[in-house]
């Protein structure tokens, strides 16, 4: 019962998280104009991953898409990629986890298959959450860097020098949505992985071998639980997720040091 609850809760938490990641990715308020010096502004600027917007105090809002691909900063492209990968992995994870739910019976699917699917979806949710958190964090770091670089700028008018303060941008609502959503997806993934443990009953994971000794009937089960579920010392199953960042030199088509534990 506890396993079913853990799995179900993990699914729901991940579902909310992925919905949040999608929402954050689509939101326009990734960065918003810093209003520290001017709390009431007649023109308010904010930007998303896909377009930038201007809201005028009279109510008119105009948004313009980034119609160039090559002209965009590499960091923005990277953030887009991370968020999309997070959404795709999360969506696949949701699809897999639906079939893995203990409360849903599909044909004669064994618990071991459901356990594997639960683990797979859990890993997918974890990676999805990490992608979202990484994407949002990269964007936030970019904002912080640009914020301090945006010092007073000089515009030259025909009548001489006129000083104007360059528009500075700070964290938008989408960043917080993204962080929370990524965290929820991550938590949901961990819960799925935990549920996987209980979904694989010992009886179905190995064959019991009976040895009959004279005078005594003793059942000896070699290897125990650890030998067959992938949570013990089985080296083939040990690598669940490699969260390590790689440099360009390290990403190779042939096996690297990250491919083995």
């Amino acid at each position: 019962m506890a396993v079913t609850a853990c799995q179900g809760l993990g699914f729901v938490v991940s579902l909310i998280g992925i919905a949040g990641i999608i929402a954050a990715t689509c939101m326009d308020q990734w960065s918003t104009q810093d209003l520290y010096n001017n709390p009431v502004t007649a023109v308010f600027n904010y930007q998303g991953l896909w377009r930038s917007c201007v809201r005028e105090s009279s109510g008119f809002t105009e948004c313009r898409g980034y119609f160039t691909l090559l002209g965009l900063p590499a960091m923005l492209q990277a953030v887009r990629a991370l968020m999309i990968v997070g959404i795709v992995l999360g969506a696949i994870g949701l699809l897999v986890s639906i079939f893995a739910l203990k409360c849903i019976r599909i044909g004669s699917m064994e618990d071991s298959a459901k356990a594997n699917m639960t683990l797979t979806s859990g890993i997918m949710f974890i990676v999805s959450g990490l992608c979202a958190i990484a994407g949002v964090s990269v964007f936030a770091n970019m904002l912080v860097t640009n914020f301090w670089m945006s010092t007073a700028n000089m515009y030259t008018g025909m009548g001489g020098m006129v000083q104007t303060v360059q528009t500075r941008y700070t964290f938008g609502a989408a960043l917080f949505v993204g962080w929370v959503a990524g965290g929820l997806t991550l938590i949901g993934g961990v819960m799925m992985c935990i549920a996987c443990r209980g979904l694989a009953p010992e009886e179905t994971n190995y064959k019991a071998v009976s040895y009959h000794a004279s005078g005594h009937s003793v059942a000896y089960k070699p290897g125990g639980f650890k030998a067959s579920t992938g949570f013990g010392s089985n080296t083939k199953n040990k690598k669940i997720y490699d969260g390590g960042a790689r440099t360009e030199d390290e990403v190779q088509s042939y096996p690297s040091k990250h491919d083995y534990v």
């Epitope: 104009q33 001017n38 009431v40 502004t41 007649a42 023109v43 600027n45 904010y46 930007q47 930038s52 917007c53 201007v54 005028e56 105090s57 009279s58 109510g59 008119f60 105009e62 313009r64 515009y155 008018g157 006129v162 104007t164 360059q166 528009t167």
Partner: antibody, heavy 118, light 113 residues
Framework: QVQLQESGPGLVKPSETLSLTCTVS?????????WNWIRQPPGKGLEWIGY???????NYNPSLKSRVTISRDTSKNQFSLKLSSVTAADTAVYYC???????????WGQGTLVTVSS | DIVMTQSPDSLAVSLGERATINCKSS????????????LTWYQQKPGQPPKLLIY???TRESGVPDRFSGSGSGTDFTLTISSLQAEDVAVYYC?????????FGQGTKVEIK
């Protein structure tokens, strides 16, 4: 097309409160615009007084902020201006206007002359 | 507050001739977010309320004759009437629409020579 019409007393005594109402027709004051008051002293230029946004938020000219209140009545589709402690310097033609794109004043009322005199 | 200064104060132009009004702001009216200049031009005829002519420095309001054009960026702006007509006799105002409080120029009176 939105039409605006100002109404209120044409004569106000010094130190009293000037009260004007702008009636909106052909549109709703709950629509996504800012509803402004602007004044023009006789033979002089224009001065923005303030606005009430469709959401009810207000924004005033700092030079008049301490004396100005702009409010609205959505049921009557009207918005109002109250200017307290008036002096002869407040004598002007008062316009109500709606602003939208470019923060520009798109529609204007015909204006009403308010004279401050004892 | 942003101070708007118009020049000249008055202008006499022959019918069919070009009229040029200048407006200078004390701060830049260019918004970096959309690369638009928040400057508006109005026409006011005697006994009438002002009428919107140009917004975003160069965008003509619908119904405004194409002889009216706006130009400029940052702090220096120009309203041009390419061929003055009798009905263009009025006072023209520029307005800062970028920063609160919204402020107007002192006005330029256009007359026929």
């Amino acid at each position: 097309q939105v039409q605006l019409q100002e109404s209120g007393p044409g004569l106000v005594k010094p130190s009293e409160t000037l009260s004007l109402t702008c009636t909106v027709s052909g549109g709703s004051i709950s629509s996504n615009y800012a509803w402004n008051w602007i004044r023009q002293p006789p033979g002089k230029g224009l001065e923005w007084i303030g606005y009430i946004y469709y959401s009810g938020n207000t924004n005033y000219n700092p030079s008049l902020k301490s004396r100005v209140t702009i409010s609205r009545d959505t049921s009557k589709n009207q918005f109002s201006l109250k200017l307290s402690s008036v002096t002869a310097a407040d004598t002007a033609v008062y316009y109500c206007a709606t602003s939208y794109y470019g923060n520009s004043f798109i529609y204007w009322g015909q204006g009403t002359l308010v004279t401050v005199s004892s | 507050d942003i101070v708007m200064t118009q020049s000249p104060d008055s202008l006499a132009v022959s019918l069919g001739e070009r009229a040029t009004i200048n407006c200078k702001s004390s701060q830049s009216l260019l918004n970096s977010g959309n690369q638009k200049n928040y400057l508006t031009w109005y026409q006011q005829k005697p006994g009438q309320p002002p009428k919107l002519l140009i917004y975003w420095a160069s965008t003509r309001e619908s119904g405004v004759p194409d002889r009216f054009s706006g130009s400029g960026s940052g702090t220096d702006f120009t309203l041009t009437i390419s061929s003055l007509q009798a009905e263009d006799v009025a006072v023209y105002y520029c307005q800062n629409a970028y920063s609160f409080p919204w402020t107007f120029g002192q006005g330029t009176k256009v007359e026929i020579k």
